[in-house]
Interface confidence: low
């Protein structure tokens, strides 16, 4: 007689990342009997929800249910029916919703309420929707990458990113979204001078003093809005000659859209026109200078700061840069470990100077909205990392642009689920975890 395969003793979890520009659903899977081991949870599916971020549904909340349907139905297909009722679903909203809440708590509540009602109608164990704090976003991103890299336990079987002498150091986490950016790492024997930026964790029997900060309004999309609002102040007419866009590029912007976000409030002024036209001139150096004006470095009440008076300890160790840090650099073909900071800057100068018509031809398959912003985004990443966070040409070598680790996306969602399902023990489990290479 033929042997029947025993049913897999596995568990599933779902996290929706409701970001400022879009929502993604992640499905995670792990062996039920190994919940407390490190590295056993892995991503089996990512479903990108079609449409904008949930904060854009504020005037059309009745469409939220339909918006979420495709990815929730996909989750129904991927996860065996017998496990639907015990599969937790979490939705975390990030900086897009933080900004909406700043404008109107009632409107943010309305969106979240409809999201909760919609997700409650599925057969899963829905655990709630909430706006996570910037601190949580940074912390969970740090937990995710270090969990996937096996940094929290002694077992090291496959990692080749760094030398053996440094194997047990945790990685710092650099996360770039559309509306905020996070920096999180363990400083070397340094007091974290600002209590708001200090986190204490005990994970797998080891204590970690972690620095984290989330810069709201400094995600790539909001940073661009800030830059435009700043630059239009000094424009002599309704033409904005912009070095961060390719030569020959033209786009009309509504002033009302520019001032819609709380991020541009500090630059708001009464303009003698309702629209203006961006005309690209494609100059990296000028673009870089314009971006630097967004970082206030003149004031620092601590021993050292990033920008805007925010404490930042000396950088320490290796960093994983993910989310938009990775997507933008991947598009620009600059994620290789071998590319020096000087080389990246050279490549950006050349890329930004390319005429818009040429760019459109070279990247015919890419949506023009995204394509037009890579010069700005790439320049912004360099400015943020070098002048904002004080990476140098030397420490640049310690930045690893990471999309996935062992098939799981780098980002805050896995860390969030691990925390909420109590799958990261404070003490080292008694059983020895299997090395990653054991898992297919």
């Amino acid at each position: 007689t033929q042997n029947k395969a025993l049913p897999e003793n596995v568990k599933y979890g779902i996290v929706l990342d409701a970001g400022s520009s879009h929502t993604s659903l992640y499905i995670y899977k792990w062996p039920a009997e190994k919940e407390n081991d490190t590295g056993v949870v892995h991503q089996v599916e990512e479903c990108r929800v079609k449409g904008p971020g949930i904060s854009k549904f504020v005037q059309k909340v009745n469409e939220i249910g339909i918006y979420l349907t495709d990815c929730m139905e996909r989750a129904r297909e991927v996860i065996p029916r017998s496990q639907h009722q015990e599969t937790p679903v979490y939705l975390g909203a990030t900086a897009g919703m933080r900004l909406l809440r700043m404008e109107s708590e009632e409107l943010a509540d309305r969106v979240l309420d409809v999201v909760e009602r919609s997700l409650s109608n599925y057969p899963f164990d829905f655990q709630g929707a909430r706006i996570i704090t910037g601190q949580e976003e940074g912390a969970y991103g740090w937990i995710t990458i270090n969990y996937l890299l096996g940094r929290f336990t002694q077992e090291q079987s496959w990692l080749s990113l760094i030398s053996d002498s440094q194997k047990q150091e945790t990685f710092g986490a650099l996360d770039l979204g559309g509306a905020s950016t996070q920096v999180t790492f363990v400083p070397q024997n340094q007091t974290i001078e600002s209590p708001d930026n200090a986190l204490q964790f005990r994970l797998y029997g080891k204590d970690y003093n972690v620095y984290t900060h989330s810069f709201l309004c400094y995600g790539k999309d909001q940073a661009l809005w800030q830059k435009l609002a700043k630059d239009i102040q000094v424009a002599s007419n309704e033409i904005l000659r912009d070095p961060c866009f390719h030569p020959g590029y033209k786009k009309v912007v509504n002033v009302s859209d520019l001032y819609k976000t709380p991020c541009t409030k500090r630059f708001e002024m009464t303009l003698p026109f309702q629209q203006f036209e961006i005309q690209g001139i494609g100059n990296y150096q000028q673009c870089h200078q314009s971006i630097l004006e967004l970082f206030n470095t003149s004031y620092c009440p601590y021993s050292q700061c990033a920008f805007n008076g925010i404490f930042l300890p000396p950088l320490q160790g290796d960093f994983g840069a993910f989310s938009a840090f990775y997507f933008v650099m991947k598009f620009l073909n600059l994620t290789s470990e071998k590319v020096s900071q000087e080389k990246v800057t050279e490549m950006m100068k050349k890329f930004c100077a390319q005429p818009w018509e040429e760019i459109k031809t070279s990247y015919a398959g890419v949506k023009e909205k995204y394509l037009s912003e890579y010069c700005f985004s790439g320049t912004y990443i360099l400015s943020l990392l070098l002048q904002g966070y004080h990476f140098t040409a030397d420490s640049w070598e310690h930045i690893h642009f990471i999309g996935k680790i062992q098939g799981s996306d780098a980002g805050w969602t896995l860390g969030y689920m691990l925390n909420l399902t109590n799958m990261i023990p404070a003490e080292q489990p008694l059983s020895t975890p299997l090395s990653h290479s054991t898992y297919v």
Epitope: N62, D113, R130
Partner: antibody
Framework: QVQLVQSGAEVKKPGSSVKVSCKAS????????ISWVRQAPGQGLEWMGG??????NYAQKFQGRVTITADESTSTAYMELSSLRSEDTAVYYC???????????????WGQGTTVTVSS | GIVMTQSPDSLAVSLGERATINCKSS????????????LAWYQQKPGQPPKLLIY???TRASGVPDRFSGSGSGTDFTLTISSLQAEDVAVYYC?????????FGGGTKVEIK
């Protein structure tokens, strides 16, 4: 001051449907989450479902049998329960609130209740 | 869903004495974003709809006498009537509005001894 006024008592046969209305006055109806709660004779309170901002949500027990709708033009919410059986005999209440975000203050305004008797 | 367990089922207290009702939720109803507990207490008198007494576990609804107070956090909550009056004879319910489906406790009947 928001007030909720419900339709009158109903006597129904098993297998039939009942539709109870709940009219709001004195408030912006479009931003009111409305919950429906029932109470069988001598029993406790049981949440059936609710509607808010155009989206309905139902307790698993009633899924497929209950339909909650709202008509903003008349500021009225409706709860329809089908395939009635004798154990559906209860007082049915509508209440404002009951959504985690929009109903942050619990169910603060209640209708007077509608008695539905299911009997052959 | 979250199961709400109330105790005791009934309670007889002398006029002017303290009445204490407990409510336990099967999982935490504390929302970390705003540090609020999504728990309400209701009073229901015979032939009347329920009346909201307390929301967010400890905030009195408008018009509720200050002899009614709510306390607790996470999974364990208490409704206290500091000095029972004749008009307080009723059934009291706790309810979570943290997650759908919204759920009520089984109720506690308060009578005069």
């Amino acid at each position: 001051q928001v007030q909720l006024v419900q339709s009158g008592a109903e006597v129904k046969k098993p297998g039939s449907s009942v539709k109870v209305s709940c009219k709001a006055s004195g408030g912006t109806f479009s931003s009111l989450p409305i919950s429906w709660v029932r109470q069988a004779p001598g029993q406790g309170l049981e949440w059936m479902g609710g509607i808010g901002f155009g989206t309905a949500n139902y307790a698993q027990k009633f899924q497929g049998r209950v339909t909650i709708t709202a008509d903003e033009s008349t500021s009225t919410a409706y709860m329809e329960l089908s395939s009635l059986r004798s154990e559906d005999t209860a007082v049915y209440y509508c209440a404002r609130g009951g959504a985690k975000y929009a109903g942050r203050y619990g169910m603060d305004v209640w209708g007077q209740g509608t008695t539905v008797t299911v009997s052959s | 869903g979250i199961v709400m367990t109330q105790s005791p089922d009934s309670l007889a207290v002398s006029l002017g004495e303290r009445a204490t009702i407990n409510c336990k939720s099967s999982q935490s109803v504390l929302f970390s974003s705003n540090n609020k507990n999504y728990l309400a207490w209701y009073q229901q008198k015979p032939g009347q709809p329920p009346k909201l007494l307390i929301y967010w576990a400890s905030t009195r609804a408008s018009g509720v006498p200050d002899r009614f107070s709510g306390s607790g956090s996470g999974t364990d909550f208490t409704l206290t009537i500091s000095s029972l009056q004749a008009e307080d004879v009723a059934v009291y319910y706790c309810q979570q509005y943290y997650l759908y489906p919204l759920t009520f406790g089984g109720g506690t009947k308060v009578e005069i001894k």
